[in-house]
């Protein structure tokens, strides 16, 4: 079974800068999985943000504009990254990655 680790406990960024979060996948080939990213804002329910499937197709939360959250995966390091562009106060949250084994 696959195992996920998010090595960064926290990330502090200046407003309007870019934040890059990592999710390391082990126990399964990342290219054979779909990786999902979610966020939990203080006092709110968890929200799907974006996913990348085994074939590289990206899907996003329909209500968030393209260009805000960018997901990628690096097979060499078995890592998925979530890049948050133009960081603003409403991006303060806990971000989770999840795995769907194909």
């Amino acid at each position: 079974a696959g195992h996920l680790e998010q090595p960064q406990i926290s990330s502090t960024k200046t407003l309007s800068k870019t934040a890059r979060l990592e999710c390391v996948v082990s126990g399964i080939t990342i290219s054979a999985t779909s990786v999902y990213w979610y966020r939990e804002r203080p006092g709110e329910v968890i929200q799907f943000l974006v996913s990348i499937s085994y074939d590289g197709t990206v899907r996003k939360e329909s209500g968030i504009p393209s260009g805000k959250f960018e997901v990628d995966r690096i097979p060499e390091t078995s890592t998925s990254t979530l890049t948050i562009h133009n960081v603003e106060k409403q991006d303060i949250a806990t971000y989770y990655c999840a795995l769907w084994e194909v």
Partner: antibody, heavy 118, light 108 residues
Framework: EVQLVQSGGGLVKSGGSLRLSCAAS????????MNWVRQAPGKGLEWVSS????????FYADSVKGRIIISRDNAKNSLYLQMNSVRADDTAVYYC???????????WGQGTLVTVSS | EIVLTQSPGTLSLSAGERATLSCRAS???????LAWYQQKPGQAPRVLIY???GRATGIPDRFRGSGSGTDFTLTISRLEPEDFAVYYC?????????FGGGTKVEIK
């Protein structure tokens, strides 16, 4: 059937203001982010602005920042673009476009021409 | 800002021929975030291709996108009369979203 019907274009004097509207139907407007894209006569496409479903995220191209305001009214299924202090280089066909789950602009309005005169 | 440069500016071909359109990015982008649009005179653009292998609903399989990093290609395997139009690439991974300058495919 998804439809985006635009209105509000026309001739406006340099320095003036204009509001464009985009009426949406055929999908749950309140759950999708929306965009404005423009095309100057004989030129290519230029992204202008995006707005999230709840209006919490708003982005502008540098070329229009401070002069254009994007907004939406989910109760009316409508998207707006308020253009202020217009310049000659704002002359273009303006399109509203729906932002799909795949990230691409999957449906477009018919376009409305804005002409800025001196 | 990611600048997308399309070439050639104009492609003169006959129906039945193969068309190869290029889109070069000023910095590396994921193929997951590259799309191709078609625009005919007096009409709004319509999406053809998205991501590494996606084809929009109703788009025939003669349209194919490929590439990675900074170099991307739209291939139309066999041009039909309705394919003569302007084609734009777009990156939608990071704001500002940007389009290429377009390639016009015209009848030779």
């Amino acid at each position: 059937e998804v439809q985006l019907v635009q209105s509000g274009g026309g001739l406006v004097k340099s320095g003036g203001s204009l509001r464009l509207s985009c009426a949406a139907s055929g999908f749950t407007f309140s759950t999708y982010s929306m965009n404005w894209v423009r095309q100057a006569p004989g030129k290519g496409l230029e992204w202008v602005s995006s707005i999230s479903s709840s209006s919490s995220y708003i982005f502008y191209a540098d070329s229009v920042k401070g002069r254009i305001i994007i907004s939406r009214d989910n109760a009316k299924n409508s998207l707006y673009l308020q253009m202020n202090s217009v310049r000659a280089d704002d002359t273009a066909v303006y399109y509203c476009a729906k932002d799909g789950e795949l990230g691409v602009f999957d449906y477009w309005g018919q376009g409305t021409l804005v002409t800025v005169s001196s | 800002e990611i600048v997308l440069t399309q070439s050639p500016g104009t492609l003169s071909l006959s129906a039945g021929e193969r068309a190869t359109l290029s889109c070069r990015a000023s910095q590396s982008i994921s193929s997951s975030y590259l799309a191709w649009y078609q625009q005919k005179p007096g009409q709004a653009p319509r999406v053809l291709i998205y991501g590494p292998s996606g084809r929009a609903t109703g788009i025939p399989d003669r349209f194919r996108g490929s590439g990675s990093g900074t170099d991307f290609t739209l291939t139309i395997s066999r041009l039909e009369p309705e394919d003569f139009a302007v084609y734009y690439c777009q990156q939608f991974g990071r704001s500002p979203l940007t389009f290429g300058g377009g390639t016009k495919v015209e009848i030779k």
